[in-house]
Amino acid sequence: VPGEAEQPAPELVEVEVGSTALLKCGLSQSQGNLSHVDWFSVHKEKRTLIFRVRQGQGQSEPGEYEQRLSLQDRGATLALTQVTPQDERIFLCQGKRPRSQEYRIQLRVYKAPEEPNIQVNPLGIPVNSKEPEEVATCVGRNGYPIPQVIWYKNGRPLKEEKNRVHIQSSQTVESSGLYTLQSILKAQLVKEDKDAQFYCELNYRLPSGNHMKESREVTVPVFYPTEKVWLEVEPVGMLKEGDRVEIRCLADGNPPPHFSISKQNPSTREAEEETTNDNGVLVLEPARKEHSGRYECQGLDLDTMISLLSEPQELLVNYVSDVRVSPAAPERQEGSSLTLTCEAESSQDLEFQWLREETGQVLERGPVLQLHDLKREAGGGYRCVASVPSIPGLNRTQLVNVAIFGPPWMAFKERKVWVKENMVLNLSCEASGHPRPTISWNVNGTASEQDQDPQRVLSTLNVLVTPELLETGVECTASNDLGKNTSILFLELVNLTTLTPDSNTTTGLSTSTASPHTRANSTSTERKLPEPESRG
């Protein structure tokens, strides 16, 4: 074409895939009449007529652009809809009058790639490989033109480095004309790279300027030989019997070696392998003092069959042994003295305390409790508590019952019971003493005895209320080899005038109706008489 060599550079029009490109014919009025223009696409030096404008009216030529072209701006602009990558070419408009002139437009098409997808090499990388190994693959799909990839490690871009870093990129063209980029990062890694964060970045251009997209960060499994194995105990700090203790092996290699935990047998000094759970953890639950000792861990690399041994670790499970009190079942005469001695073993310094069981009162701080001039009230429970002050919750206790020889001691001397004639009455009588007393009743009825504790007995009697019984009352007699004692239960007939709600004189009332032989329980609601009780 004459004068083609001097043609100016084409006008650049940039547009994203899928949008509409506005191709404005830049011919001036002197160069041609815009109401008579032909539009061409130029592909590989070949022009193809795609649109005609005659008297301001446009007409598409048959072909690939037939459905996507329209005239705008009173015929000066050709609109190309649904732009695809294949539309990246030169378009030219040619005016026919007064003389043939043309105006060239370079259409540039862009499409942002999808978010880059990064896949780490699942097999991992050994640190002692001779050449760079595949670390990760980055894929950027459906971009146009081909985006640029930059690999980063710990936020720093990676450069090609002979025998150290190699980036291998390739691309494929999809049927849509878009590009899918695949980049493989190969590198020689060192042990310190086990925590390194790798990611890839795609750089691409849009009409609006330069952009980039980053992948997620990944770490790659790095395999390196174990140099050291060690033991870790949880919980940290002082351990005590009853705790849940976990002993685990750790190693600085990846993959970790095959672990075994052994404990030194104190008598043979031999290491004996312990049974661990599926995770290789030795769980001591509950921990016992026998678990104390020297533990060590062996790590065996199954590839090289190299075995490493940890530093031994002393485990101390603190304990307090069973507490022993002597004498264990003391029996003493009234007025005598008694020394109670408490003993226990522990892995730590022990503190002893003596408490009165019935009241919780602390009687003595120390292992020896001395009781002088014993009264029968001194009989009963004494508890020795052996504890390790430095380890909260580590303590053992032992209860000792002190028996004071003496005749039976009645819970009450006299008691009044409200009754109705012909009712079956349930009476109870309690006595204590050492030796433990037995209880008898002065009336016929069904009696049963219950031992409350080694020195105390409770007897219950079911008896029918008769006029004779009302007259005599009921006596219970407690006896042992040292003597006897009696309690008297006075029976009083209930009448409506005595039934005042807060009567201080009623000590018991059956709520049963007074039909003959109705069974009732007079003791379930008994209250003691207001006068002081005798301890006979």
Epitope: A328, A329, E331, Q333, L399, N401, A403, F405, H434, P435, R436, D451, Q452, D453, P454, D481, L482, G483
Partner: antibody
């Protein structure tokens, strides 16, 4: 030291009587219970009776009630077992033993042999 | 009467062995935490000797290799490591009620 010493054993004809003694020393006699326990040759132990010297209260194994009597002489710290109407099956070593109020026997005498034979 | 049944009646063991003798009462001999069960050792021609009182308490002067346990009706005497002087006959006894009764005895012999 605490000691119980039995005496009075020997050979006796069936139907006759025998009195065994148990001398206590080294402890307050009236503060403990004294028991008689017997053991037939090659057999096990059998509790016979008990006394509390402080109050003279006695208990017997029903098997021996009526034939055997337990007693004491407080002034001599001595306990007795009077055995009447003796039978061949009463042949045994007779031990006296001490207890507290939980009735376990913490001190025993060496025993005295009684043989009932015609 | 409460019947006391000991097992085994006889037992052969060696020095250093751990030995357990059991005693079963025909009814409970325990009262609120106290078990009225006692163990004795008797050697030929000698009086019985108290080993364990109230089920688990070691009598003063008795070696700690002897121990007792149990409650209710079932009780055991354990010798943790037999010594030559332990070969003897062992008896259990209850004192829960009258009459006090003994087990028939367990004869411990040298194997």
């Amino acid at each position: 030291q605490v000691q119980l010493v039995e005496s009075g054993g020997g050979v006796v004809q069936p139907g006759r009587s025998l009195r065994l003694s148990c001398a206590a020393s080294g402890f307050t006699f009236s503060n403990y219970w004294i028991h008689w326990v017997r053991q037939a040759p090659g057999k096990g132990l059998e509790w016979v009776a008990r006394i509390y010297p402080g109050t003279d209260i006695t208990y017997y194994n029903e098997k021996f009630k009526g034939r055997f009597t337990i007693s004491r002489d407080k002034s001599k710290n001595t306990l007795y077992l009077q055995m009447n109407s003796l039978r061949a099956e009463d042949t045994a070593v007779y031990y006296c033993a001490r207890s507290g109020g939980y009735w376990y026997f913490d001190v025993w005498g060496a025993g005295t042999m009684v043989t009932v034979s015609s | 009467d409460i019947v006391m049944t000991q097992s085994p009646s006889s037992l052969s063991a060696s020095v250093g062995d751990r030995v357990t003798i059991t005693c079963r009462a025909s009814k409970s001999v325990s009262i609120s935490g106290y078990s009225y069960m006692h163990w004795y050792q008797q050697k030929p021609g000698k009086a019985p000797k108290l080993l364990i009182y109230l089920a688990s308490n070691l009598e003063s002067g008795v070696p700690s290799r002897f121990s007792g346990s149990g409650s209710g009706t079932d009780f055991t005497l354990t010798i943790s490591s037999l010594q030559p002087e332990d070969f003897a006959t062992y008896y259990c006894q209850h004192s829960r009620e009258l009459p006090y009764t003994f087990g028939q005895g367990t004869k411990l012999e040298i194997k």
